[in-house]
């Protein structure tokens, strides 16, 4: 069981600093950009992390929504990332949903973040490079040390 | 709990392949990975490399990436790992071992070699 | 590679005595370190991974601590059974790679 807390507004960078954004085609993708990129790319750039109460505590369970035209909520639906056109629900009944990520700080470094997802233990987020695009993937990870799979999550408000 | 049993000791000579097997007894759940590690006489461990069961992917040390492969059949829980071209340097203990998750208080999680198997000694000589 | 550099390679100490093993990282490897124990003629048995989590069952003589670059295992009170060789493993990225193992002897 998951239930909804409070929002907060993020830009979510790579290790490479490279910006999230939703593009056109609401496709998530990395792209380098200046902090005034960034403001002018708005609301592209600025996601909704919303946080969820965890019946089981396995971390902090989030959302990650972004609001163009309409709202849009991220999920790894068969282990594919793509964003949904539904707002964060304010309850999830299930231990396991495929819009919950666990957001957890790499050790010892609090400004890094790992996103786990709830549906599919070991997937998480990471950033891979596709011919010339920089792609928001699930990523099957055993390699917990891998620079692909940490963010940094800038709060906006 | 867990138990890996390997298969029996290997006297081989130079040049030739050895295939050793790692079956899986007792309830595993899914998300492992399979590992190697060899140990020369009165050496340290070496990683060699690991095989995903879930899609047969592998990482191999560089040291071994031309001569080893690593597979695993899923219908009997058993991984393989084949070495080629053996030489007298070669001669080790070879162990089967299990990579899975296990987590902290918060859910963090940290990959762990926990059960292993008992070892299968491979001898080369000539 | 990661390159670790366990020390010492050999320990002599006594029964109740306090021993400390280290492992020095050429790089941040974020606590993902394991200890393991191993005994003649037996596979290595887990001892603490994420650098200071006690394994189940795992006398709590034994612990870890460190974070970055630098990891320590320590015995506060060293038992007769406790001898034997110890590694420790990174496992932050890929090649894995192990010390170079501390060889411990009960005086």
């Known amino acids: 069981y998951f239930g909804k807390l409070e929002s907060k507004l993020s830009v979510i960078r790579n290790l490479n600093d490279q910006v999230l954004f939703i593009d056109q085609g609401n496709r998530p993708l990395f792209e380098d950009m200046t902090d005034s990129d960034c403001r002018d790319n708005a609301p592209r750039t600025i996601f909704i992390i919303s946080m969820y109460k965890d019946s089981q505590p396995r971390g902090m369970a989030v959302t990650i929504s972004v609001k163009c035209e309409k709202i849009s909520t991220l999920s790894c639906e068969n282990k594919i990332i793509s964003f949904k056109e539904m707002n964060p629900p304010d309850n999830i009944k299930d231990t396991k949903s495929d819009i919950i990520f666990f957001q957890r700080s790499v050790p010892g470094h609090d400004n890094k973040m790992q996103f786990e997802s709830s549906s599919y233990e070991g997937y998480f987020l990471a950033c891979e490079k596709e011919r010339d695009l920089f792609k928001l993937i699930l990523k099957k990870e055993d390699e917990l040390g891998d620079r692909s799979i940490m963010f940094t999550v800038q709060n906006e408000d | 709990q867990v138990q890996l049993v390997q298969s029996g000791a290997e006297v081989k000579k130079p040049g030739a392949s050895v295939k050793v097997s790692c079956k899986v007894s007792g309830e595993i759940s899914t998300g492992y990975y399979f590992h190697w590690v060899r140990q020369a006489p009165g050496k340290g461990l070496e990683w060699m490399g690991r095989?995903?069961?879930?899609?047969?992917?592998?990482k191999y040390a560089e040291r071994f990436k031309d001569r080893v492969t690593m597979t695993e059949d899923t219908s009997t829980d058993t991984a393989y790992m084949e070495l080629s071209s053996l030489r007298s340097e070669d001669t080790a203990v070879y162990y089967c071992?299990?990579?899975?998750?296990?987590?902290?208080?918060?859910?963090?999680?940290?990959?762990?070699?926990?059960?292993w198997g008992q070892g299968t000694l491979v001898t080369v000589s000539s | 590679d990661i390159q670790m550099t366990q020390s010492p390679s050999s320990v002599s100490a006594s029964v109740g005595d306090r021993v400390t093993i280290t492992c020095l990282a050429s790089?941040?490897?974020?606590?993902?370190l394991t200890w393991y124990q191993q005994k003649p003629g037996k596979a290595p048995q887990l001892l603490i991974y994420?650098?200071?989590k006690l394994q189940d069952g795992v006398p709590s003589r034994f612990s870890g601590s460190g974070s970055g670059t630098d990891y320590t295992l320590t015995i506060s009170s060293l038992q007769p059974e406790d001898e034997g060789d110890y590694y420790c493993?990174?496992?932050?990225?890929?090649?894995?790679?192990f010390g170079q193992g501390t060889k411990l002897e009960i005086k």
């Open positions: 790089e941040d490897i974020y606590t993902y």
């Open positions: 071992t299990t990579w899975r998750i296990y987590r902290d208080s918060s859910g963090r999680p940290f990959y762990v070699m926990d059960a």
């Open positions: 994420g650098a200071n």
């Open positions: 493993l990174q496992g932050s990225k890929f090649p894995l790679t």
């Open positions: 095989i995903d069961p879930e899609d047969d992917s592998t």
